[in-house]
């Protein structure tokens, strides 16, 4: 391994010895208090037992204190997300202390070695926190550890080892390999702080999951299902980011957690909300857009403390870049069938028309299959605030997209040559906004014209009985 370190996690600089007997021993973990928003500023290095730098660098004992903990590194340098996060924290919390935990020498190793070093780094942070607690006015409750990837588990160790309870730990896509399914004391867990919130952006059920799949906090948020992040596909990264390989797609998705957190700091006026759900598929079906019984929350820095919950999985959709906020809608569509539609799934799109803006043509994603003579639930989301919904247009795409659909069309035609047409009968669509929790029912203008076939469209307006509103005000007023 490229760094000589001893059992106590200390570096021995033997690269140049002026005297034959001299060996300079240095702590392998450094704490850099970022005293300026200027990323080039060298800041102040803090060390246990040395009070002078705290005074010299105006460490604010009564303010919030953030510890940013990086993860495994292949390059041995601080990546560019770090100064973005530092700057965002300074912008949002002007009086706060922002400390970067530099454990690069122990992280710039083989991954397995870096994993084995996480415990000693956690110990170092705990020792620093124990020392700071000896100072007047310093409160562990004001400490917020923010760990990315392997750094999230380092934060867990720190929270476990410290005397007392840290206020909050945020895990930004905690590392998966060697931690998935691990014992509660060998990874980040809800016991490590008063509140542990986690963002999962690179989880995979097949192949290697760079981020941990299992929930490890009080609330565990899985943006876009926790796997494929918009803007991180191979096509996207080849053209838009300084990445050109599969490994860079991985980096984009893994690091998305950091940018979602930064977004929550700097775009306060556009907070993203997540919704509790048992799994990603149910969320994709649009079943889980409820805010009752604390089933929804802000994501990132603005997350509301929910200590009664544990390993609560929450989901949301996002945009491809900042601001990441989207507006979620649940559509409940009762579908009757006039004519047998065979095995083919209809390709349906909806356009929402609002008082502020109109949406694009949004696909109704069929997660499993459409149930006929039943109410089907769909999730759609828009990138802009449409305002109050006024009307909507449902279209059934006429051309089959897949060979499977094409084959089924052909098979249906052969079995029913006299009646090849397919029709759905839809009289009303119930819409619920995730962000406002408002419910509105839309009806076809003419009840006699409620059928739709491939290549056709159907218009819906607010039903005559008007708005069906459960909540007059948004439940998020107290969350923001």
């Amino acid at each position: 391994s490229p760094v000589p370190f001893g059992p106590e996690g200390r570096l021995e600089d033997k690269l140049h010895k002026p005297k034959a007997t001299q060996t300079e021993v240095k702590p392998s973990v450094r704490f850099n208090l970022r005293t300026s928003k200027d990323p080039e500023h060298e800041g102040c290095y803090l060390s246990v037992g040395h009070s002078q730098p705290l005074e010299d660098c105006s460490f604010n004992m009564t303010a919030k204190t953030f510890f940013i903990i990086h993860g495994w590194t292949m390059s041995g340098i601080f990546e560019n997300w770090l100064h973005k996060l530092v700057s965002a924290l300074h912008t949002r919390e002007k009086d706060a202390n922002v400390v970067v935990v530099d454990w690069l020498p122990l992280a710039h190793q083989l991954y397995t070695d870096a994993v084995n070093n996480t415990r000693v780094v956690g110990h170092s942070i705990a020792r620093m926190l124990d020392w700071l607690q000896e100072k007047d006015d310093f409160s562990l409750g004001n400490v917020h550890l923010i760990g990315y990837s392997l750094g999230a588990h380092v934060a867990g160790y720190a929270g476990n080892f410290v005397k007392g309870t840290v206020g909050r730990i945020t895990g930004l896509d905690p590392a998966g390999p060697m931690f998935e399914g691990a014992d509660i004391h060998k990874r980040l867990s809800p016991d490590d702080a008063d509140f542990v919130d986690v963002l999962h952006t690179y989880t995979r059920s097949f192949g290697l999951s760079i981020g941990i799949q299992m929930p490890v906090g009080h609330i565990d948020i899985y943006p876009n299902g926790g796997d494929f992040q918009p803007g991180c596909g191979l096509n996207d990264v080849l053209g838009s980011i300084a990445y050109g390989t599969i490994t860079e797609v991985v980096k984009c998705e893994h690091e998305r957690a950091v940018h979602l957190f930064v977004d929550s700091l700097v775009n306060q006026d556009k907070p993203s909300f997540a919704f509790q759900c048992t799994d990603s598929n149910r969320f994709k079906k649009g079943i889980c857009l409820s805010c009752r019984k604390n089933r929804c929350n802000n994501i990132g820095y603005n997350a509301k403390k929910m200590r009664k919950k544990r390993n609560s999985k929450m989901y949301l959709k996002t945009r491809a870049g900042m601001p990441f906020k989207v507006y979620h809608y649940q559509l409940k569509v009762h579908m009757f069938s006039y004519n047998n539609s065979g095995d083919t799934q209809p390709t349906l799109y909806i356009t929402l028309y609002g008082s502020n803006a109109d949406s694009q043509n949004l696909p109704l994603e069929i997660v499993e299959k459409i149930e006929l003579n039943a109410t089907n639930t769909f999730l759609v989301y828009t990138e802009e605030d449409l305002g109050d919904l006024l009307k909507m247009r449902l279209t059934w795409e006429g051309v089959a997209h897949s060979w499977y659909n094409l084959w089924n069309e052909f098979r249906n035609y052969l079995s029913q040559p006299s009646n090849p047409s397919r029709e759905l009968y839809i009289r009303r669509i119930r819409v619920k906004s995730g962000e406002t929790q408002r419910k509105v029912t839309f009806c076809t203008q003419d009840p006699t014209k409620s059928s739709i076939s491939p290549g056709q469209e159907l218009w819906f307006h607010k039903c005559q009985d008007g708005w069906k509103m459960k909540n007059k005000t948004s439940p998020f007023v107290n969350l923001a």
Epitope: L15, P39, I77, N80, D102, L104, P105, L238, A242
Partner: antibody
Amino acid sequence: QIQLVQSGPELKKPGETVKISCKASGYTFTNYGMNWVKQAPGKGLKWMGWINTYSGVPTYADDFKGRFAFSLETSASTAYLQINNFKNEDTATYFCARFSYYGRHYFDYWGQGTALTASS
Amino acid sequence: DIVLTQSPASLAVSLGQRATISCKASQSVDYDGDSYMNWYQQKPGQPPKLLIYAASNLKSGIPARFSGSGSGTDFTLNIHPVEEEDAATYYCQQTTDDPPWTFGGGTKLEIK
């Protein structure tokens, strides 16, 4: 003020070993990374790699793996570049340049350069 | 590795006129709203001097006649109005997350 002062020019025979120094002053040496950059006569700049001045861990560009070694004498705020088995194509001016660990990694201060020439 | 191609290789500009130097990257050097492209000036017998960092930020102490622009893969250094002392070779450099940090081939500016 911030300064990077490099050792003087040298004439070297092929096969010899040469070690050039870069002494930093005006800032905390271990708080900034140190790069090495090569410039052959009449040619452009070529990044050789960098060394973490706190941990002593070097990183080399592909073309400079093997015969080149970065090292430190932290107590003297000095970085070193050693070239083993000196070759004709190593004739160039070598610059040290610092960068901030926490920033955007541009090279804000440079040494004056050390000219190495191969003597046949 | 990211390859930087500068053009032209050399140019001659009259005193007081505008000099424009281009740098094209083989892939984007943008990251989360910032472009990790820097510009340096080198005069004969001297080390390079940082002029512009992150595509458009002027280093303190550098005259305002130097300006940088661009994003993604296409970047430009402008000098206007050109002065006698600006005769030098100019290099672009990318410093994205993953080294190697590469330089362009250089553009030699002569004053007519």
